[in-house]
Structures are given as C-alpha cells and as structure tokens.
C-alpha cells in the first residue's frame, strides 16, 4: 500500500493585494480517514488558517466541497487578501482519532502579496531658501509589497541626480516604506517649477504613481532695487521713483527716509505677477526741494519676507543759488546702495549726476 | 470531540408521524454528511437516507423515498428525519451517524431514538 | 441494488482463536484500488461502531487483532485472538452506491 502523499504543486503564489488567493492541495490517497488542516508557518508557534473539521474561518472556503464523496482535494481560497497574509502555507494531513494525529504535511506555498505602494507624498524646506541656494525634498510612500520598487526624481521634466534613498525595513517584511531625499539647487526662474518623485511599482502596471512639490512654497526671489529722480518739477518739487523688481513672494514692506528720518511706510499688496512668477512694485516720494538747505538724503529700505532690510541710497543735491520761480534749479543727485547682512544680489552700486 | 446527541424516545400510534433530532457538536456540522439508519428490535442494521447540511442535498434508500424527509438546521448544528404514515413494524431504534471520510460510511453514531409505533 | 450476504449468520469462537466473518457482495465494490466495504461492530444495547473502512483500514482506537481484507466481491473480516469484549454483532456495509448493511454476524464465545 503506498504511503499517503500530500501534494502542494506551487511553491510560490502571488496575489494582487484585495484579490483572493487559491492554495492548491490534493492528498494522493483516501486513506487513512482524517481531517486536513492549513497552517501558515511550521513548529510550534504555526498559526491555523483551516480546518475543514471545526473552526469559524471567515475569510477561507474550500475550493472542493468537502462533503463530495472521494474528495482528494483539500485546496483553500482565501479571500480578500493583505499584505498581513504573507507567508508559507501548510497542508497538513492528521488520521482520525481522539484527538485527530497529525500524519503528514505537504512541502508548503510560499504567498506573497503584491500591494501597491501608497500615493507618493513630497515635502520640502520648512522655511523658505533664498535662489542659489539648495534645498531638499523628501518624498514617502508606504504599504508595498514586494520590495523592488524604482523612485525617480524630476524637475521640469529634467531628472534630478543628487538624491538618496532608503527602502525599510531591510529584512523580510510583509510590507515596505521608501523614503528619499532630493537635493535642489534653486534659480530667480524656479518661481513656477516644480518638483515631481515618479513611484514604479511591479503592482502599478507600468503606470507610475506621482507626488508633486512647487518650488513657489519652498523658495524666496530677493528683489533687485533702483532708486531713480524724475525731473525737477516747476513748483520746485523732485519725484524720487524706487522700483523694486523680480522678487516673491509678495510679502514686502518698503519704507522710505529722509536724511534718516521715516517719512512713509508702504506694504505691497494684489501686485500683478510677471511671467516668472515674480512681482515688481513701484514707489515714489516727492521732496520739496525749497523747504531744504542742504542737501536731502533719501534711502528706500525694503524688507522683503521676513528677511533683514535692504536699502538703496540717493542724495538730492540742493543748490546753494537762489532759484527764480519757474525755473530750472540744478540739483545734483547720488545714488548709493546701503545694505543691512544679506545674501541679496543687488544691481551694481550707481552714482547718478544729473545737471539740469 | 465529535458528539451526536439525539432526542428521547417517542410513542406514536400508526398513521401519525414522528420527527427525530440530532444535534450535533466537536465539528463543524456543514462540512460532513449525516446518515440516518435504524434498527427494529433483535433485527440487523437498516440505511434509511443521508443529507449535506451544507446544500441539503439528500439521498433516499427507496424504501423511504415517499415517506421519510431529512432536514437541517445549521444555525444549531441539528439534523432532522421525520417519517410519516407510521406502521408498527417502523417500531425501531432511529440512528444518526456521521460520515467523517466522506465515503458513505458512518464513523460516529448518535445512541439512538427508540420510536414505538403501538395503536 | 448491491445486496451484501455475510456468512456465517452466526459463529462460536473459543477466547485466544481465530474468528472469521465473511462479506460477499452481489456486484463487485472495488475500483482505483479501493474497495468500498467497511466493517462495524455492535455490542448490545448500544450504536454500532466502525473497525474497519475501506476493506482493510482500522479505524482509530481499533486494536490490532481485527483485520480486513478481500477485494471485488469478496471480504473477510478477522479477529486473530479472541477476547471476551469482542462479543457482538458484526455487519459488513457497501458504499460503492448507495449504503446498504450485510444482515449481520452473531460472534459468542465458545
């Protein structure tokens, strides 16, 4: 009489995360009488999944009705699978007895459950960085199975190379994580960029998962100052212009001295943006040239983000001649640039001299 | 362990039915067959019919086809087997048995329900 | 229908010999090289109880000293040394169709 086989023909099954699994088991005789029974892992601490004899197995059904005369095959669904369903699954044969012996188990069916990995999540910087400077994103995502897994980072489409990348845990697991930094150089152009990390998973039929990040929550454009004199009006009135350009964001306070004192503060607010993403804001003071002796030192100090003040400089020349009502009168104006410690790339220092 | 617990004996008068039941425990009760035999006194062993509690799919000795109906109730794991137009000669010991092979055999038994069929 | 004939209807068999019951069925039982007969004692006042499945298989809890054998249309069912316990009714059932029982061996000590 031959000995009594138990028959698992897979050693693998891969289940799609949601999806039922079927483990495969026939028995190669009817004898000796007795129950079979599923267990995920093997000694002491296996775990039962079936036992066509008694138990409430929810999420397990037998593939075959067991009540079918000769039946010789003890397959199992499981339903519903997670990536917690992980593991090697055991047929066991017991004889009949009391209580029922165990006899034999069949070699075991490795399950391994592919999950897709969840909607890649992209952070950045916590505080703003000023343009040239590097900033670092971090992408996650989590819950996938099996463990290759291909993260890609991008930049306007280019793709970034300065990054690391982790997938945890090392060791086996029934799920994984990935995390991966990337760092990025900012540009004064990065305003309307953004970074995109791209997911590749086995589970993703080549239709990759993407988390974005715009470069606008992470950076800050510095602005560029000019202050400037219009001509000399015939109420003896000179309009001082102080055009500040190319910065974001918008947040910007910009108040203007004379000879030191504060004569207005201005905040910049629903500024119209350029094609960059940036914002220009004009400002303008008018000095009453006559109500001076001397010369009238007028500096525009902006004080953009949160970030030390930058101060643009420009002396108004008052001549030491009477002036004739309705005339010209020859002012003499330099500008110089004053700056508090900042990274802010500025124009070049200019020194104006203009003979009306 | 796998008990078959039957209900207690009955005395009818010919013509009138009577209903046994066998509840059972220690297994679960959808995955095997019951069979129902019986025994008249000092004679042998008699297949009446068996039921799947889990389809009630049945099958009859046809002797009994026209007069006995087995049933289940699987929410409290008991079988039924009532037989109707009651003889005296039908004056027997009613048997549940399980069929834990699922070979048509009867691997364990109920102790029995004596039916006295007596005018 | 199968019918099953066991013979003898009954037997005397001194404690310690050999006893032999034997099962013949009107058709053959036996296909794939199983044989659809099992083999059941009943003591009195009490259910049957199954030794044998399969013409030759003891059941749990069975001792050694019954055995089964036979195939196609004939069985036969041994008790190599008698005990006392073993005094019974002694039935031989099919299962190739529907069940139906032999009518029984009385076994008594002789």
């Known amino acids: 009489e031959e000995e009594l086989q138990v028959i698992q023909p897979e050693k693998s099954v891969s289940v799609a995360a949601g999806d039922s699994a079927t483990l495969n088991c026939t028995v190669s005789s009817l004898i000796p009488v007795g129950p079979i029974q599923w267990f995920r892992g093997a000694g002491p601490g296996r775990e039962l999944i079936y036992n066509l004899k008694e138990g409430h197995f929810p999420r397990v059904t037998a593939v075959s009705d067991p009540t079918k005369r000769n039946n010789m095959d003890f397959s199992i669904r499981i339903s519903n699978i997670t990536p917690a369903d992980a593991g090697t699954y055991y047929c066991v044969k017991f004889r009949k007895g009391s209580p029922d012996v165990e006899l034999k188990s069949g070699a075991g069916t490795e399950l391994s459950v592919r999950a897709k990995p969840s909607a890649p999540v992209v952070s950045g910087p916590a505080v703003r960085a000023t343009a040239e400077h590097t900033v670092s994103f971090t992408c996650e995502s989590h819950g996938f199975s099996p463990r290759d897994i291909t993260l890609k980072w991008f930049k306007n489409g280019n793709e970034l190379s300065d990054v690391q990348t982790n997938v945890d845990p090392a060791g086996k697991s029934v799920s994984y994580s990935i995390r991966s930094t990337a760092r990025v150089l900012l540009t004064r152009r990065d305003v309307h960029s953004q970074v995109i990390c791209e997911v590749a998973h086995v589970t993703l039929q080549g239709d990759p998962l993407r988390g974005t990040a715009n470069l606008s929550e992470a950076i800050r454009v510095p602005p560029f100052l000019e202050v400037t004199q219009q001509s000399m009006r015939a109420d003896n009135q000179v309009n001082v212009t102080c055009q500040v350009t190319k910065f974001y964001p918008q947040r910007l306070q910009l108040t203007w001295l004379e000879n030191g004192n504060v004569s207005r503060t201005e905040m910049a607010s629903a500024l119209p943006e350029n094609k960059d993403g940036t914002y220009n804001w004009t400002s303008w003071l008018l000095v009453n040239v006559s109500a001076h002796r001397d010369d009238v030192k007028l500096t525009c100090q902006v004080e953009h983000d949160g970030q030390p003040a930058v101060n643009k400089s420009f002396s108004v020349k008052v001549s030491a001649h009477p002036k004739e009502q309705g005339s010209n009168t020859a002012a003499e104006n330099t500008g110089t640039n004053e700056r508090g410690s900042s990274d802010y790339k500025d124009d070049d220092d200019k020194h104006h001299h203009h003979h009306h | 362990q796998v008990q078959l617990v039957q209900s207690g004996a009955e005395v009818k008068k010919p013509g009138a039915s009577v209903k046994v039941s066998c509840k059972a425990s220690g297994y679960t009760f959808t995955n095997y067959w019951i069979n129902w035999v019986r025994q008249a006194p000092g004679q042998g062993l008699e297949w009446i019919a068996m039921?799947?509690?889990?389809?009630?799919?049945?099958h009859y000795n046809q002797i009994f086809k026209d007069r006995a109906t087995l049933t289940t109730d699987t929410s409290t794991s008991t079988a039924y087997m009532e037989l109707r137009s009651l003889r005296s000669d039908d004056t027997a010991v009613y048997y549940c048995?399980?069929?834990?092979?699922?070979?048509?055999?009867?691997?364990?038994w109920g102790r029995g329900t004596l039916v006295t069929v007596s005018s | 229908d199968i019918v099953l004939t066991q013979s003898p209807d009954s037997l005397a068999v001194s404690l310690g010999e050999r006893a032999t019951i034997n099962c013949r069925a009107s058709k053959s039982v036996s296909s794939s090289g199983y044989n659809y007969i099992f083999w059941y004692q009943q003591k009195p006042g009490q259910p049957p109880k199954l030794l044998i499945y399969l013409a030759s298989n003891l059941d749990s809890g069975v001792p050694d000293r019954f055995s089964g054998s036979g195939s196609g249309t004939d069985f036969t069912l041994t008790i190599s040394s008698l005990q006392a316990e073993d005094v019974a009714v002694y039935y031989c059932?099919?299962?190739?169709?529907?069940?139906?029982f032999g009518q029984g061996t009385k076994l008594e000590i002789k």
């Open positions: 059932q099919e299962s190739w169709e529907l069940p139906t």
């Open positions: 039921i799947d509690p889990s389809d009630s799919e049945t």
């Open positions: 048995a399980m069929d834990y092979g699922s070979l048509y055999a009867m691997d364990y």
